[in-house]
């Protein structure tokens, strides 16, 4: 009685259970009454990452420097190449097919999380007591200067974009 289902790492063809090709190899010929499945290794710059019956290997991803990409991890016969972005850039998607410049946080906003190769800068508004007077992809919100600790008084209040201005205390007559 021909099988209707096959074991793991096998596939059904012509009423026979044939072994799948292992990762890194492609199918040349299905198994027969006389032979096991015939598989061949993937070529240079090709891969297959699963047990398979593919007759063609997949091409490794190309990390195009014109799109700001560089190789993070070189592909093997069993794995695809992993791309990441050049310094100062990040991927536009999980697949990392292109890059964009890291966003800068405007004055009044500070960096909550510095960008990585795969995620953009996360900015946050500077809360009361903090300020940022630059557009930056690295600078956090800085605390206002404490005039008291310098034996000075606040002459001009700070904002989310400016520090306080300290001055000498008025002398009592």
């Amino acid at each position: 009685e021909p099988p209707t289902a096959c074991r793991e790492k096998q596939y059904l063809i012509n009423s026979q259970c044939c072994s799948l090709c292992q990762p890194g190899q492609k199918l040349v010929s299905d198994c027969t009454e006389f032979t096991e499945t015939e598989c061949l290794p993937c070529g240079e710059s090709e891969f297959l990452d699963t047990w398979n019956r593919e007759t063609h290997c997949h091409q490794h991803k190309y990390c195009d420097p014109n799109l700001g990409l560089r190789v993070q991890q070189k592909g093997t016969s069993e794995t695809d190449t992993i791309c990441t972005c050049e310094e100062g850039w990040h991927c536009t998607s999980e697949a990392c097919e292109s890059c964009v410049l890291h966003r800068s946080c405007s004055p009044g906003f500070g960096v909550k999380q510095i960008a990585t190769g795969v995620s953009d800068t996360i900015c946050e508004p500077c809360p009361v007591g903090f300020f940022s007077n630059v557009s930056s992809a690295f600078e956090k919100c800085h605390p206002w200067t404490s005039c008291e600790t310098k034996d000075l008084v606040v002459q001009q209040a700070g904002t989310n974009k400016t520090d306080v201005v300290c001055g000498p205390q008025d002398r009592l007559r």
Epitope: N14, V28, S29, E33, F34, T35
Partner: antibody
């Protein structure tokens, strides 16, 4: 439908080289393997060697030093070359696909001066 | 080189009677993937061999169910439950587990 047909000289002189061609139709040699078998008159079957779909070959060690099997996928042909012939190489030569029951009709090769 | 030894060499049988042919291998025919590539052919006079049984016990398409194969490891048997006139010829066992593939010496079945 699947067909295999052997062709070559019926008579070859001792010490010469035998060249046989197996022309196939109904399938691609890049996806299927083909092997050669011979049968001396009134005797049993002897496996000669095979050409795998991927292009590699396996030979019978008793013939390996005299044997070359190759293929031209675009022409759908598998070739057998057997050198330094003797009378013991007189046989019907068959090419066979390695699945199902697809045999050529066979070609008789006589080695004689 | 792996040897396949068939017995008997000659098998005279009465029509309608059963017949049995043995094939013994000099080493195990189980492949690394667990398949046993032992096959049976019938060669009628003046014809090319015809596949009857593949992988020990699988009847090839169109082969009558009076033919059956059994065995494992190194000992294998072809049985014909009721011999018919068209069954006359030489029966060969064959293995394709190990290179070189080999054939048994043949068993000639004839009608008594």
């Amino acid at each position: 439908q699947v067909q295999l047909q052997e062709s070559g000289p019926g008579l070859v002189k001792p010490s010469q080289t035998l060249s046989l061609t197996c022309t196939v139709s109904g399938f691609s040699l890049s996806r299927y393997s083909v092997y050669w078998v011979r049968q001396p008159p009134g005797k049993g079957l002897e496996w000669i060697g095979m050409m795998w779909g991927g292009g590699s070959t396996d030979y019978n060690p008793s013939l390996k030093s005299r044997l070359t099997i190759s293929k031209d996928t675009s022409k759908s042909q598998v070739s057998l070359k057997l050198s330094s012939l003797t009378a013991a190489d007189t046989a019907v030569y068959y090419c066979v696909r390695t699945d199902g029951d697809y045999w050529g009709q066979g070609t008789l090769v006589t080695v004689s001066s | 080189e792996l040897q396949l030894t068939q017995s008997p060499l000659s098998l005279p049988v009465t029509l309608g009677q059963p017949a049995s042919i043995s094939c013994r291998s000099s080493q195990s025919l189980a492949s690394s993937q667990g398949n046993t590539y032992l096959h049976w052919y019938l060669q009628r006079p003046g014809q090319s061999p015809r596949l009857l049984i593949y992988k020990v016990s699988n009847r090839f398409s169109g082969v009558p169910d009076r033919f059956s194969g059994s065995g494992s490891g190194t000992d294998f048997t072809l049985k014909i439950s009721r011999v018919e006139a068209e069954d006359v010829g030489v029966y060969y066992c064959s293995q394709s587990t190990h290179v070189p593939w080999t054939f048994g010496g043949g068993t000639k079945l004839e009608i008594k």
